[in-house]
Amino acid sequence: MNGRVDYLVTEEEINLTRGPSGLGFNIVGGTDQQYVSNDSGIYVSRIKENGAAALDGRLQEGDKILSVNGQDLKNLLHQDAVDLFRNAGYAVSLRVQHRLQVQNGPIGHRGEGDPSG
């Protein structure tokens, strides 16, 4: 019997300072290239090693970015979203949605990593 997969969704405001090579992440999504079915939102697809986002540590691959400096990212073409980030200035405020997967196993199920027994 398989456990049910639930998601814990949280939101966070992340303030990044643009580094020498930029903000340090990649995005996917947009109205013209949906990354998630029926969702044209903008998602983080890669955190670059030693980039501003990686050094800050809060932004994660898979996070949905809801806004940049207060500007909503809904219904944007992919390239328009890229341009918005590129022109966001030195101090960049991101409103992000983290989606944490929570595995709910059946009662009495012991996970493989359970040290007991």
Partner: nanobody, 127 residues
Amino acid sequence: EVQLVESGGGLVQAGASLRLSCAASGGTFSSYAMAWFRQAPGKEREFVAEDSWSNHRVWYSDSVKGRFTISRDNAKNTVYLQMNNLKPEDTAVYYCATYRDYSGSTVDPPNQSEYDYWGQGTQVTVS
């Protein structure tokens, strides 16, 4: 091992055109970002143009926008740089560079530190 070989450089007069080619081998280059950089005598190497496969996105430096065009032929594993209305300040060694592209678009300007593989360069001189 990835190898890049540039060709097409030469000596031309201001206002002329040149087309540079970069032939790549050792990889499946439809899934690589490919770019041109240049280095003028006594200056640091600078970004010229990039073609990123994942979103069919091209970027240009402000100094070449409207004059240079980057394109690629994945069947031939070749990337081109069409340079029109050349100026003396375009004189430099032009390098082809590539890196394995990642999903999505970088929100940052292209940065040469991301590029894993470089050609030997081809000299362009505009008099």
